[in-house]
């Protein structure tokens, strides 16, 4: 079976406040009403789930309250923001999209976005 195509940027640099945003776009083969988006982090050949949200088309994405992710959706495009990132969180962040309803179920996995996080230099003590 052909996989659903998912596109995401190759590289994103997190802000000095540890926030990274990127767009995950999927080529929907059908008229999905319910979509699940999962962000996976791949580092040292290990894959872990960062966050996930199921949303109804036309509605907002709702991540769990303690999630480090937020997002908005527009058509077949999801704008994802990951917060609280530190240098040790640098890695490949993969967008996985599933069309949950109605059938047929489709799964698409992006190639990943390499997010670089640089911890800010501590401010030197000012002599005033």
């Amino acid at each position: 079976c052909k996989a659903m195509h998912v596109a995401q940027p190759a590289v994103v640099l997190a802000s000095s406040r540890g926030i990274a945003s990127f767009v995950c776009e999927y080529a929907s083969p059908g008229k999905a009403t319910e979509v699940r988006v999962t962000v996976l982090r791949q580092a040292d050949s290990q894959v872990t789930e960062v966050c996930a949200a199921t949303y109804m088309m036309g509605n907002e994405l709702t991540f769990l309250d303690d999630s480090i992710c937020t997002g908005t959706s527009s058509g077949n495009q999801v704008n994802l923001t990951i917060q609280g990132l530190r240098a040790m969180d640098t890695g490949l962040y993969i967008c996985k999209v599933e069309l949950m309803y109605p059938p047929p179920y489709y799964l698409g996995i992006g190639n990943g976005t390499q997010i670089y996080v640089i911890d800010p230099e501590p401010c030197p003590d000012s002599d005033f």
Epitope: C1, M4, P102, P103, Y105
Partner: antibody
């Protein structure tokens, strides 16, 4: 073991109501799309209604739209079919079925687990 | 909705015979065609998905082929336990629809 067990069938008069239940076990019910498929005596299979894992999306065959309501309680691992304004032509064995959403397959389009069915007879 | 037409509606064959059932879709459905077996008084059981893939645990005497609008289901050597009605189901366009079934009996 993955299992679906239907209940709630029986004899009902035309215009009456009935609520079918389907108890699920052995799999993650809340992430599975669930469906009702019926089979009239001596006839073929007809998809009736379906619901997404979250319960947020539903769909119905034209023949039951406006009369039947599908719902689920993920805390109880149970699927329901509320049938109102029943007609003689609704007489059938009603099966609940899991629609496979396999996370190592990129597209799926089949029912992989079925219950044993419950008979609904609409007659005066 | 896509219409599925199965033939024959019933057949009788001897143990060991090769049995073939065909299923035709009213429009092209790629390879999104599944086959189920239903024994008397029992629920349907998935045998083949996506036209030719054997479900886990299903004997290799069952096979399927085809794409587009024309599909074939074959039992290479009929066994007494294969007495059942067989249904095709299209999985290309929602809602899924089934063929009317083919009843297989032993001579």
């Amino acid at each position: 073991e993955v299992q679906l067990v239907e209940s709630g069938g029986g004899l009902v008069q035309p215009g009456g109501s009935l609520r079918l239940s389907c108890a699920a076990s052995g799999f993650t019910f809340s992430s599975s799309s669930m469906h009702w498929v019926r089979q009239a005596p001596g006839k073929g299979l007809e998809w009736v209604s379906g619901i997404s894992g979250s319960g947020g999306s539903t769909s119905y065959a034209d023949s039951v739209k406006g009369r039947f309501t599908i719902s689920r309680d993920n805390s109880k691992n149970t699927l329901y079919l509320q049938m109102n304004s029943l007609r003689a032509e609704d007489t059938a064995v009603y099966y609940c079925a899991r629609y496979l959403m396999s996370f190592n397959l990129t597209r799926t389009s089949w029912f992989d687990v079925w219950g044993q069915g419950t008979l609904v007879t609409v007659s005066s | 909705d896509i219409q599925m037409t199965q033939s024959p509606s019933s057949l009788s064959a001897s143990v060991g015979d090769r049995v073939t059932i065909t299923c035709q879709a009213s429009q092209a459905i790629s390879n999104y065609l599944n086959w189920y077996q239903q024994k008397p008084g029992k629920a349907p059981k998935l045998l083949i998905y996506d036209a030719s893939n054997l479900e886990t645990g299903v004997p290799s005497r069952f096979s399927g082929s085809g794409s587009g609008t024309d599909f074939t289901f074959t039992i290479s050597s009929l066994q007494p336990e294969d007495i059942a009605t067989y249904y095709c189901q299209q999985g290309d366009a929602w809602p899924w629809t089934f063929g009317q079934g083919t009843k297989v009996e032993i001579k």
